[in-house]
Structure formats: C-alpha cells, structure tokens
Amino acid sequence: LTCLGGFASPGPVPPSTALRELIEELVNITQNQKAPLCNGSMVWSINLTAGMYCAALESLINVSGCSAIEKTQRMLSGFCPHKVSAGQFSSLHVRDTKIEVAQFVKDLLLHLKKLFREGQFN
C-alpha cells in the first residue's frame, strides 16, 4: 500500500493555494523581466471583476510563442470554468483598449493580491 500510494492522484488543490501559486508565478515574471515581455505584445484590457479569470485568459491566450507566460496561461485556465480559445472576446474587455503584456501581468498581480487579502479565492 505504501508503494501504491505514490500512484494515487492527489486531491484537488485548495483555491487559496492555487491563487497563491498564480501570484507567485506573476511575481517571478515581473521580477525576472529583462527584455520586453513577449516582445512587447499587446493584449486587451479588462474593465470588470466578475469572470475576471476567464477574461484575463482570453487576453493572454492571444499571445503566442511566449514561453514566459505559458505557465500563467495554464494556471488561469484552472480558474476558468469554460474552455477558452484564441480569438474570443469577452464583454469584460475594454474595446479598442490594448496594453502591453508586461503591464497587464503587473496589473493582474496587483488585482490578485487584493483578492487574496480579501479572501476571495474563486
């Protein structure tokens, strides 16, 4: 049984842990940034809080070939209840308003830190 225990699938990650891990990943990105993140790619800005994880993923998923944010994209997909694909456009986005990926990641970090402090883990 002890040996078989290694094959058992771990239980679901608590939302607070998942959020903390996402925050840590964003901190890593912002602190380790040397050249312009994702070659200065632009993404849609967001103007609301409800459904924010999906909206953030919808913005970032349109950035391709940027390994620095691939982990963030995967982590955000864990918070979004539906499948997100490139080209989707949510009502949460500010139309005609794009910002640099680096700024978006920084802003997302700020927002998630607030949510964590307030105990809003979902």
Epitope: S45, I46, E100, K106, L110
Partner: nanobody, 118 residues
Framework: GVQLLESGGGLVQPGGSLRLSCAAS????????MGWARQAPGKGLEWVSV????????YYADSVKGRFTISRDNSKNTLYLQMNSLRAEDTAVYYC???????????WGQGTLVTVSS
C-alpha cells in the same frame, strides 16, 4: 506606456463648480484604487479624494468633505472629481494618480490648474 491625462481645470468664481476628468490609458484602470491630489502655490502635495478599484469605497480630506465628489467609469477608463462650492483655498494644481500605496504601482498625471478667484 501608462498615461493619465487631466482636464476640466480653469478659472472659477468662489461658490462656483468645476468637474475634473482624468482619462487613463496603458494600464488596467479598473483594478487600481485612484485618487485626486492637489498642490497649492507654495504648499505641499495633499490627497483630496480616493476611490477604490470598483468604487466600493471613497475617502475625502476634511477640507473638501460635503463639497467634492469622486467617481469613476471603468468602462471609459475615466476618473472624475466634481467640485462644488469652491473656495479661494481650493486654488491648486490637481493631479490624477493611482492610489495603491506602493511605488511599484505609482502613476501620476501632469496636473490641471484650478484657480478660484473673483
């Protein structure tokens, strides 16, 4: 990059009203606490009013309570300051700024001059 552009300042008589606007761009405006600060001639910078990210809470300096109203429109990336019953001592350059209390997230506009004089 990040830009905060104030407008609406000008010359107004005591007792008059002005509405300042701040158009934000280059960052996720909706996720930031925002505020208005002012600097009167020969004086230091003081916070006039602050509004939380989704407008859930507001702060006003005692000197403007009951006269000034801060608001925001996240869909337009715009911050407002409605100033009523203006007094000579409200004369100052008014700055729009993020109000996160953290230098990492610190952004300021260039300011707009408000002059209250008869």
């Amino acid at each position: 990059g990040v830009q905060l552009l104030e407008s609406g300042g000008g010359l107004v008589q005591p007792g008059g009203s002005l509405r300042l606007s701040c158009a934000a761009s280059g960052f996720t405006f909706a996720w930031y606490d925002m505020g208005w600060a002012r600097q009167a001639p020969g004086k230091g910078l003081e916070w006039v009013s602050v509004i939380s990210d989704y407008g859930r809470g507001t702060y006003y300096a005692d000197s403007v309570k009951g006269r000034f109203t801060i608001s925001r429109d996240n869909s337009k990336n715009t911050l407002y300051l409605q100033m009523n019953s203006l007094r000579a001592e409200d004369t100052a350059v008014y700055y729009c700024a993020t109000a996160e209390g953290d230098d990492t997230f610190d952004y300021w506009g260039q300011g707009t001059l408000v002059t209250v004089s008869s």
